[in-house]
């Protein structure tokens, strides 16, 4: 989707299967107010953009409303009446699901249920990833509905857990982005905590029965 | 491996529709590929005609998109091509073929050549 | 539409030798072009996609390059398999191929 085009980068961005944010970055035109032509279906005329998103004073990019929409997007960016670019572009390959909403945590023992909701369509993976500061790299648990339940943990660690949200590639393709992480939360001993020390604290010793 | 055959009458009495199906084999028409025509006239080069999405959006050739109709049946894992007012110029073996992604076709069906004549 | 021009129409090449096709874009395509290779009465096959991208199973010896409007397809020293006709793709606006070379023993 990027790739030079008369010196121009084009990136697509389909918010959540809600908003399309096609973005430009034209170093011949950098000083130029290039304007955006789009349809959803290859037998209407072009409408023009009409929210812009601007840089340093010239236009960037454009947002769209395309709430739900199984479409491709024809568009054309010109210069005046000169096409600088066109393309059409089947708008899901290019999906970024919102970020998790509502996220819970549900503790057991040395296992948490991390829930939170889902987006209101299919075909995506609810991803967690924790650490602790004992450990070097986050590990990772994914499943198709935000339940996800990982086991095996120290209960007295603490932890750090992030979720995020990825489209299926044998679904959507490999061109998607996934979305933004939720925020970090902290747990040890299955309360919540401000954060985790960055220096492990040694463990307490174990009292000989 | 994914497998692609082509199916329909050879031979198409001018001014009539020439119907093809394409029926899809070892892999999910559902996935997040497109399904596409291509045509080659005898001795000549090749044409695209157009795809479709499992979902049913199709992506026409601009110069034939008034006659060509292009439909998916995801329960038979098939896609039909349906080009209507033909004439001679539209005799060619006809190809489907598997757009992946945004990568080019790299399955094919093996052709079938249809004729259009009286 | 985007029109794509192929060139030359017909090369004649020995084996072992290094041939050069070119596909030129009528106004700019990025980088969403193919190559494919098609011998008499068979389907064409794959070579490359995204301009410059080997599909799998395909000879190191075939690559590709180019971007905007202007592309190249390279084989490095031809062998008996590669002569064929070869076509481009343009898939960036609607879809288009070149009108081929055929690539023929000298």
């Known amino acids: 989707q990027g790739g030079a085009a008369e010196g121009v980068q084009i990136q697509i961005i389909y918010f959540n299967l809600e908003t399309v944010q096609v973005t430009w970055n034209a170093s011949k035109y950098s000083r130029t107010n290039l304007t955006f032509h789009y349809r959803f279906n290859g037998d209407e005329a072009y409408d023009q953009c009409t929210n812009y998103l601007l840089q340093e004073g010239h236009t960037s990019g454009c947002l769209l409303d395309a709430e739900q929409r199984d479409d491709i997007l024809y568009f054309s960016i010109r210069n005046g009446t000169h096409p600088v670019f066109t393309a059409s572009r089947w708008m899901v390959y290019y999906l970024k699901p919102s970020s998790p909403k509502h996220v819970r945590f549900s503790w057991h023992q040395d296992a948490v249920t991390v829930t939170c909701s889902d987006l209101s369509y299919g075909d995506l993976l609810y991803e967690v990833q924790y650490r602790s500061p004992f450990d070097t790299e986050w590990q990772s648990k994914q499943e198709n509905t935000c339940n996800v339940t990982i086991e095996g943990l120290d209960a007295e660690k603490c932890y750090s857990f992030w979720v995020r949200v990825k489209a299926m590639e044998d679904v959507y393709g490999p061109d998607t982005y996934p979305s933004d992480w939720s925020e970090v939360t902290c747990w040890q001993r299955g309360e919540i905590r401000d954060a985790c020390a960055e220096t492990p604290t040694p463990p307490k010793p174990k009292l000989s029965k | 491996q994914v497998q692609l055959q082509e199916s329909g009458p050879g031979l198409v009495k001018p001014s009539g529709t020439l119907s093809l199906t394409c029926a899809v084999s070892?892999?999910?028409?559902?996935?997040?590929?497109?399904w596409s025509w291509v045509r080659q006239p005898p001795g000549k080069g090749l044409e695209w005609i157009g795809e479709?999405?499992?979902?049913?959006?199709?992506n026409n050739n601009p110069s034939l998109k008034s006659r060509v109709t292009i439909s998916v049946d995801k329960s038979k894992s098939q896609f039909s091509l349906k080009l209507s007012s033909v004439t001679a110029a539209d005799t060619a073996v006809y190809y489907c073929?598997?757009?992946?992604?945004?990568?080019?076709?790299?399955?094919w069906g093996q052709g079938t050549l249809v004729t259009v004549s009286s | 539409d985007i029109q794509m021009t192929q060139s030359p129409s017909t090369l004649s090449a020995s084996v072992g030798d290094r041939v050069t096709i070119t596909c030129r874009a009528s106004q700019s395509i990025s980088n969403w072009l193919a190559w494919y290779q098609q011998k008499p009465g068979k389907a064409p096959k794959l070579l490359i996609y995204?301009?410059?991208s080997l599909e799998s199973g395909v000879p190191s010896r075939f690559s590709g390059s180019g971007s905007g409007t202007e592309f190249t397809l390279t084989i490095s020293s031809l062998q008996p398999d590669d002569f064929a006709t070869y076509y481009c793709?343009?898939?960036?606006?609607?879809?288009?191929f070149g009108q081929g070379t055929k690539l023929e023993i000298k």
């Open positions: 995204k301009a410059s």
């Open positions: 070892g892999g999910s028409i559902s996935s997040s590929n497109w």
């Open positions: 479709i999405y499992h979902g049913g959006t199709t």
């Open positions: 793709q343009q898939y960036n606006h609607y879809s288009t």
């Open positions: 073929a598997r757009h992946r992604y945004s990568n080019g076709l790299d399955y």
